[in-house]
């Protein structure tokens, strides 16, 4: 079961994916593809980075975060219903059977049609917090809460740091489909 992310038609969608570089600027190739992660590489590649830079991208797909620090979260601009589906973020760690694979499910909802407001509305009601904004980042990872509630952003941020700990094993088994490849 893939972790699910939602956005509305016309919005930008945000799909989180992180890794920890061995050292600043010591990057690992990453690919993003439409469809579940296959055995190797990514299918239907929409964006790819190498050891230095983003070396392939298609229109509307970009990295908004600092990929040089391991934030390879994908932003999809101005989404349509056709953007719904599973996306694969693959951290291509050198050597065989090392890749970290994350399958993320994007659900696009039709845009809400609302009548023109007759009075000032509450800001948070007019602009509900969407998953297209940044989720929990590394600074918040100490407040884990109960395991089933941890989102993929937290898990993927923590995956390497907690590699050998019992908590990491619990995280991997928590149903968030983290996959060591």
């Amino acid at each position: 079961s893939e972790v699910e992310y939602r956005a509305e038609v016309g919005q930008n969608a945000y799909l989180p994916c992180f890794y920890t570089p061995a050292a600043p600027g010591n990057l690992v190739p990453v690919c993003w593809g439409k469809g579940a992660c296959p055995v190797f590489e990514c299918g239907n590649v929409v964006l790819r980075t190498d050891e230095r830079d983003v070396n392939y991208w298609t229109s509307r797909y970009w990295l908004n975060g600092d990929f040089r620090k391991g934030d390879v979260s994908l932003t999809i601009e101005n989404v349509t219903l056709a953007d719904s589906g599973i996306y694969c973020c693959r951290i291509q760690i050198p050597g065989i059977m090392n890749d970290e694979k994350f399958n993320l499910k994007l659900v696009i909802k039709p845009a809400k049609v609302t009548p023109a407001p007759t009075r000032q509305r509450d800001f948070t009601a007019a602009f509900p917090r969407m998953l297209t904004t940044r989720g929990h980042g590394p600074a918040e990872t100490q407040t884990l809460g109960s395991l089933p509630d941890i989102n993929l952003t937290q898990i993927s941020t923590l995956a390497n740091e907690l590699r050998d700990s019992r908590l990491a094993n619990d995280l991997r088994d928590s149903g968030a489909t983290i996959r060591i490849g």
């Epitope: 061995a22 050198p94 050597g95 065989i96 059977m97 590699r163 990491a168 619990d170 996959r179 490849g181």
Partner: antibody, heavy 124, light 106 residues
Framework: EVQLVQSGAEVKKPGESLKISCKGS????????MQWVRQMPGKGLEWMGA????????RYTQNFKGQVTISADKSISTAYLQWSSLKASDTAMYYC?????????????????WGQGTTVTVSS | DIQMTQSPSSLSASVGDRVTITCKAS??????VSWYQQKPGKAPKLLIY???NRYTGVPSRFSGSGSGTDFTLTISSLQPEDFATYYC????????FGQGTKLEIK
């Protein structure tokens, strides 16, 4: 304590089927690749293939593709190696071994824990 | 497949000797090389990984070196329990092993 316990020795006739097992304990079974390695009598080690029980990803080396089937049952933390039709040349010791993968920070990629081995003898 | 060629295939030595076993990869494998020790009737045991890192609990007399295609395992002072067969293995691509070096008592 990490342990891999394999099923007992088997004596079979050519053409028979066989399924041997490897039960992992003391670690998160779904978070590590489980590998199978063959050692024919008096010979060296040959990697056969592997399974990642977390999502069922399976890899085979070319020599063993179509010859054996690797599977796993997450619910009982057990990996399997099976043959549908054994040959005399399948006579060997078969080991399961846990694979420690690399991360972006640490290079690993090694077999860190091994089962005790299952001897398979195929003879008419 | 990447071939790993180990030499010598057998070696006689005495307790206290310094012993070196070499392994050559058919193509560049970086430092994705491990060394294993196997005693008769037993499963292999990991000694060295990443070409030069000693695995937990392995005595300091065991050391590994090399990168690219040429690798060595050195036992600085042989102990009685070190007489066994040693295998190198690469894990840059699907794992392959050398044919083994049998270390015997002289």
């Amino acid at each position: 304590e990490v342990q891999l316990v394999q099923s007992g020795a088997e004596v079979k006739k050519p053409g028979e089927s066989l399924k041997i097992s490897c039960k992992g304990s003391g670690y998160s079974f779904t978070s590590y690749w489980m590998q199978w390695v063959r050692q024919m009598p008096g010979k060296g080690l040959e990697w056969m293939g592997a399974i990642y029980p977390g999502d069922g990803d399976i890899r085979y080396t070319q020599n063993f593709k179509g010859q054996v089937t690797i599977s796993a049952d997450k619910s009982i933390s057990t990996a399997y190696l099976q043959w549908s039709s054994l040959k005399a040349s399948d006579t060997a010791m078969y080991y399961c071994a846990r694979w420690e993968k690399s991360t972006t920070v640490v290079q690993r990629n090694y077999f860190d824990y091994w089962g005790q081995g299952t001897t398979v003898t195929v003879s008419s | 497949d990447i071939q790993m060629t180990q030499s010598p295939s057998s070696l006689s030595a005495s307790v206290g000797d310094r012993v070196t076993i070499t392994c050559k990869a058919s193509e560049n494998v970086g430092t994705f090389v491990s060394w294993y020790q196997q005693k008769p009737g037993k499963a292999p045991k990991l000694l060295i990984y990443g070409a030069s890192n000693r695995y937990t609990g392995v005595p300091s007399r065991f050391s590994g070196s090399g990168s690219g295609t040429d690798f060595t395992l050195t036992i600085s002072s042989l102990q009685p329990e070190d007489f066994a067969t040693y295998y190198c293995g690469q894990s840059y691509s699907y794992p392959t092993f050398g044919q083994g070096t049998k270390l015997e008592i002289k």
